[in-house]
Amino acid sequence: SIPWNLERITPPRYRADEYQPPDGGSLVEVYLLDTSIQSDHREIEGRVMVTDFENVPEEDGTRFHRQASKCDSHGTHLAGVVSGRDAGVAKGASMRSLRVLNCQGKGTVSGTLIGLEFIRKSQLVQPVGPLVVLLPLAGGYSRVLNAACQRLARAGVVLVTAAGNFRDDACLYSPASAPEVITVGATNAQDQPVTLGTLGTNFGRCVDLFAPGEDIIGASSDCSTCFVSQSGTSQAAAHVAGIAAMMLSAEPELTLAELRQRLIHFSAKDVINMAWFPEDQQVLTPNLVATLPPSTHETGGQLLCRTVWSAHSGPTRTATATARCAPEEELLSCSSFSRSGRRRGDWIEAIGGQQVCKALNAFGGEGVYAVARCCLVPRANCSIHNTPAARAGLETHVHCHQKDHVLTGCSFHWEVEDLSVRRQPALRSRRQPGQCVGHQAASVYASCCHAPGLECKIKEHGISGPSEQVTVACEAGWTLTGCNVLPGASLTLGAYSVDNLCVARVHDTARADRTSGEATVAAAICCRSRPSAKASWVQ
Amino acid sequence: QDEDGDYEELMLALPSQEDGLADEAAHVATATFRRCSKEAWRLPGTYIVVLMEETQRLQIEQTAHRLQTRAARRGYVIKVLHIFYDLFPGFLVKMSSDLLGLALKLPHVEYIEEDSFVFAQ
């Protein structure tokens, strides 16, 4: 019968007793940077080309015995997960292996860099079809390794890496922390985060999605017909590398940004029990488990968006947080979140020709996050309109005044430090459709976009009674592009998007202050792309 | 995802002049030294010297050669293990940590990172 991990990544309507994906990834080459491999294993024989690249440190210990089966164990298993005949994801994908990890599974940043350069040289000498690079390894945060991954990604290569097995924030490890890399955490057969003894999957904002990574049966280097169970974020990353190979084989022109958005779009949503993660990481960690797309890889022209969290700003009075989209993505909105509620809002500004989402801490605050909504909007022309803060007691209005531009998001930034004297701003859909409205000392920023067939609308949901959060979702066919909070009490923690759900968070202590008439409102901007239609604001 | 996280960045305290060499004194080090926050994962003695993005091929080689020459003047032998051209401009060098201050003052140097271990996951 079909192994649990292959069943899990297969869309329900394609599940049968046998795993038979519609396309085997045959147009894609997957590079594996790992240990040596047993290339004559029946699972991968004829599918993996062992390159002459080898850059590994010496094994520890004077009496270390190099046993081929042990040396090849990790790499052989992963090659099997990606493209194995019986237990592989992309059975048609061809692979090339580079040895950057020794018999103990240890490598170096420098060896990995030289391996990545080897791939780049190969690509320059003989350009082939789409390339996927699987990096099933992790070290401490490395600026140079992240930079090398960025360069390779910008050369059109898809890099997939393990989040790490240290039960820690993936942002503290490389290449997991590189924004251009697709970083994969591990889940088990119960869709729970993998935890085995003291080890477990890494988590946090640097993880893009999760995939099966516990008790994965794959090729064993003990003999040419042996199989073994291995676990970890390497196995999870290998699943995603296989899925990426399948997607790229079906649509070879997909860019990295498109591929990442599709991986997120087709993932199983909200199946992971987030309580396993440390409390401060739960909101930052994506609740996504990778699955193959249905046989038609089209997204039905749906607008694809993802949420990108910044690093924590830190607690200083003027600390700022910055969230960035990928170069091909449009930043459609920017919001902010602070656990203490002490924040001075968020705004969009251009840095080096790219729009970024910024958030500002407030005096006495423990720090903020900036939350960017990053979308793929074909042929988009987007701009930011902002209005300085109005005098006390007056409202500030900003709308999209250019023809055919629609409002995709609002941001608000307060000049005042004292959080108690102001009412927080929000967009108001009933009185002023398509406008951002700010109150009392708020600078208001409207994100306005023009794209063929782009239409947007505001959807609000309010709760009067005590509640830690208020949510509003965009309906099927619509995509959340903006999310804001209009408080019923003076202190809100902020707002952020989780898939198609806008979440407005309220401070615990504010609940007691509420009077029944003061509703806390989550306000979502929902957009869709209908290529045949004109850009419009839906009332 | 692009922040430095739990990471060591050190601005080395450098004298304004070394051995009275005018060309060295002219260049004030703005480059930083970086290393893994986990001490057990560090590989002291091997360093990745990363040069500014627009550095030309010939300049990479010249910078590596200049480091070797200046190290030799101080009685140190250094070994250039690899030159990076295709992904980023830079080179991998085996040398004493005593030479980091000197290396950081070289023209075109953006930062230097101590090599460290990575592990199968």
């Epitope: 990790h74 003894g197 003291t198 080890l199 008790d215 064993s220 199989f227 169970s229 291995q230 | 592990f119």
Partner: antibody, heavy 128, light 107 residues
Framework: QVQLQESGPGLVKPSETLSLTCTVS????????WSWFRQPPGKGLEWIGY???????NYNPSLKSRVTISIDTPRNQFSLKLISVTAADTAVYYC??????????????????????WGQGTTVTVSS | DIQMTQSPSFLSASVGDRVTITCWAS??????LAWYQQKPGIAPKLLIY???TLQSGVPSRFGGSGSGTEFTLTISSLQPEDFATYYC?????????FGQGTKVEIK
């Protein structure tokens, strides 16, 4: 569904060799760790040893000098041989599957999910 | 070898009772522990592994806890089919060793 079935003589003479075979059905023998256990009458469970598909074995030190576990992959079977038996070797003998996975951090760890499939057991009496 | 000790050896209880069995390891075994149920003339059945993870198909009234050297098996509401002998087993190292067993009898 995986099933294990022990077979072999129910009576063995002292000083002779006890030989048992475990047949695995519903799954390939080429993935897991296959163990033998025994339980003397009215007593607790004792682990004898395991074999992996590649032929790797590990035995209980208390029995190591007398025990051999082997594997016959085409038949999907593994076997136990215990030499120089005495009355103290009288027990119900079980074969079982141990699910083990490997995970890496800085080093390699083996992680066991326990013995999740057992045979029904076969009684072996050592008597002349 | 790691020695495993169970307490009590015998336990009389009624249907609906909450039952607790304790197991001690002679050295730290982290959470590498399994619990088995065995009925007369039948092979052991795996209930819990990793000290607290319920094996697939095992009723949720069974629960495990503990780490290091002390572990507990709890049956929240004893059912007629739960009268059996229970064994703990360390999965930390070889040789795999068991506790001497706890027999749960009808009061």
């Amino acid at each position: 569904q995986v099933q294990l079935q022990e077979s072999g003589p129910g009576l063995v003479k002292p000083s002779e060799t006890l030989s048992l075979t475990c047949t695995v059905s519903g799954d390939s023998i080429n993935t897991y760790y296959w163990s033998w256990f025994r339980q003397p009458p009215g007593k607790g469970l004792e682990w004898i040893g395991y074999i992996y598909y590649s032929g790797t074995t590990n035995y209980n030190p208390s029995l190591k000098s007398r025990v051999t576990i082997s594997i016959d992959t085409p038949r999907n079977q593994f076997s136990l041989k215990l030499i120089s038996v005495t009355a103290a070797d009288t027990a119900v003998y079980y074969c079982a599957r141990e699910r083990i996975t490997m995970i890496r951090g800085v080093t390699l760890y083996y992680y066991s999910y326990g013995m999740d499939v057992w045979g029904q057991g076969t009684t072996v009496t050592v008597s002349s | 070898d790691i020695q495993m000790t169970q307490s009590p050896s015998f336990l009389s209880a009624s249907v609906g009772d909450r039952v607790t069995i304790t197991c001690w390891a002679s050295q730290d075994i982290s959470s590498y522990l399994a619990w088995y149920q065995q009925k007369p003339g039948i092979a052991p059945k795996l209930l819990i592994y990793a000290a607290s993870t319920l094996q697939s198909g095992v009723p949720s009234r069974f629960g495990g806890s503990g780490s290091g050297t002390e572990f507990t098996l709890t049956i929240s509401s004893l059912q007629p089919e739960d009268f059996a002998t229970y064994y703990c087993q360390q999965l930390n190292s070889y040789p795999r060793t068991f506790g001497q067993g706890t027999k749960v009898e009808i009061k």
